[in-house]
């Protein structure tokens, strides 16, 4: 790496992946192993995070970017930069202090994380329940009861396709 020639700050030309080495007359030196600099002009390289223990490596550290961690199988990340791991549950469950518990009746969870949420109340939108909810799935709301003529199916059939140039009868 050449010595930089900037008149203002000789370190400003040191690119990412290097640091401005005061011990070597401000020459741009490459980051040592297991360290990185993600921006130019840095006077030190940061030590890479190690994904050990409850964490595993999702992306290796390079000279210009830090390592990225995720959690071991059966767990998912929480917090900025995956600072914590939380146990996965099955769909239809939520994590409590005592472990994974089934969603109570009237609630659902369609993911392996998070909490059980109440089924949608179709009647609040003036609609009816088209498909019942389960522990894993929300209800599906359909047309309002008033939209259905007596004896008509709650599932509206598709309108027939009209040919161009023909006005409706």
């Amino acid at each position: 790496f050449e010595r930089t020639r900037s008149l203002q700050d000789p370190c400003s030309n040191c690119p990412a992946g290097t640091f401005c080495d005061n011990n070597r007359n401000q020459i741009c030196s490459p980051c040592p192993p297991n360290s990185f600099s993600s921006a130019g002009g840095q006077r030190t390289c940061d030590i890479c995070r190690q994904c050990k223990g409850v964490f595993r490596t999702r992306k290796e550290c390079s000279s210009t970017s830090n390592a990225e961690c995720d959690c071991t199988p059966g767990f998912h990340c929480l917090g900025a930069g995956c600072s914590m791991c939380e146990q996965d549950c099955k769909q239809g469950q939520e994590l409590t202090k005592k472990g994974c518990k089934d969603c109570c009746f009237g609630t659902f969870n369609d993911q392996k994380r998070g909490i059980c949420r109440p089924w949608t109340n179709c009647s609040l939108d003036g609609k009816s329940v088209l498909v019942n909810g389960t522990k894993e799935r929300d209800v599906v709301c359909g047309p309002s009861p008033a939209d259905l003529s007596p004896g008509a199916s709650s599932v509206t059939p598709p309108a027939p396709a009209r040919e161009p140039g023909h006005s409706p009868q």
Epitope: N34, D46, I47, R49, G53, V54, G81, S83, M84, C85
Partner: antibody, heavy 118, light 107 residues
Framework: QVQLKQSGPGLVQPSQSLSITCTVS????????VHWVRQSPGKGLEWLGA???????DYSAAFMSRVTINKDNSKSQVFFKMNSLRPDDTAIYYC????????????WGQGTSVTVSS | DIQMTQSPASLSASVGETVTITCRAS??????LAWYQQKQGKSPQLLVY???TLADGVPSRFSGSGSGTQYSLKINSLQPEDFGSYYC?????????FGGGTKLEIK
């Protein structure tokens, strides 16, 4: 409740090896890691190494050539061995649990006081 | 290796006072910092992890804060049972080193 109980000798001859057993209860070693730390008047608290739920280990580079950590999940026991002891290895040696949610030491054993002397 | 520098090394305070202990890392440790309390003749006990999260059962008068390389542990309204030694430890990259400790004594 969670407990870590340590057993091991109090006195070790120089150049001999140290073996400590950490017997855990209230949790399973298949789900939790265990660290080993020592505390000496001269050097304070030092992390020595850890064994993880899957059986893989990490060691401090300063002790890698002398320390071995193993475990027996079925007996809920973790085994710590350090070779070629010197007088400056005199310290209290602790095992400590690593929780499942992040890397930290949330429960500690009572400690094993080790003196290296002839 | 990342070095942890803790200050002050010792501290005298009275019951009811507020004290702050600081820990400086030699490099960025991204909030992967724990604080432990140790009473004379006992094993360390976890107080705070990830810089600011209180461990289960730890009184709310304890609080952790900080980012990057600078971290602190604050104890509001000191109680008699709070006197002892305090240590920080990082979990960024091995070896997971500890600070030198702060001995909190009763005035």
């Amino acid at each position: 409740q969670v407990q870590l109980k340590q057993s091991g000798p109090g006195l070790v001859q120089p150049s001999q090896s140290l073996s400590i057993t950490c017997t855990v209860s209230g949790f399973s070693l298949t789900n939790y890691g265990v660290h080993w730390v020592r505390q000496s008047p001269g050097k304070g608290l030092e992390w020595l190494g850890a064994i993880w739920s899957g059986g893989n280990t990490d060691y401090s580079a300063a002790f890698m050539s002398r320390v071995t950590i193993n475990k027996d999940n079925s007996k809920s026991q973790v085994f710590f061995k350090m070779n070629s002891l010197r007088p400056d290895d005199t310290a209290i040696y602790y095992c400590a649990r690593n929780p499942y949610y992040t890397n930290v030491m949330d429960y500690w054993g009572q400690g094993t006081s080790v003196t290296v002397s002839s | 290796d990342i070095q942890m520098t803790q200050s002050p090394a010792s501290l005298s305070a009275s019951v009811g006072e507020t004290v702050t202990i600081t820990c400086r890392a030699s490099g960025n440790i991204g909030n992967f910092l724990a604080w432990y309390q140790q009473k004379q003749g006992k094993s360390p006990q976890l107080l705070v992890y990830n810089g600011e999260t209180l461990a289960d059962g730890v009184p709310s008068r304890f609080s952790g804060s900080g980012s990057g390389t600078q971290y602190s542990l604050k104890i509001n309204s000191l109680q008699p049972e709070d006197f002892g030694s305090y240590y920080c430890q990082h979990f960024w990259s091995t070896p997971w080193t500890f600070g030198g400790g702060t001995k909190l004594e009763i005035k």
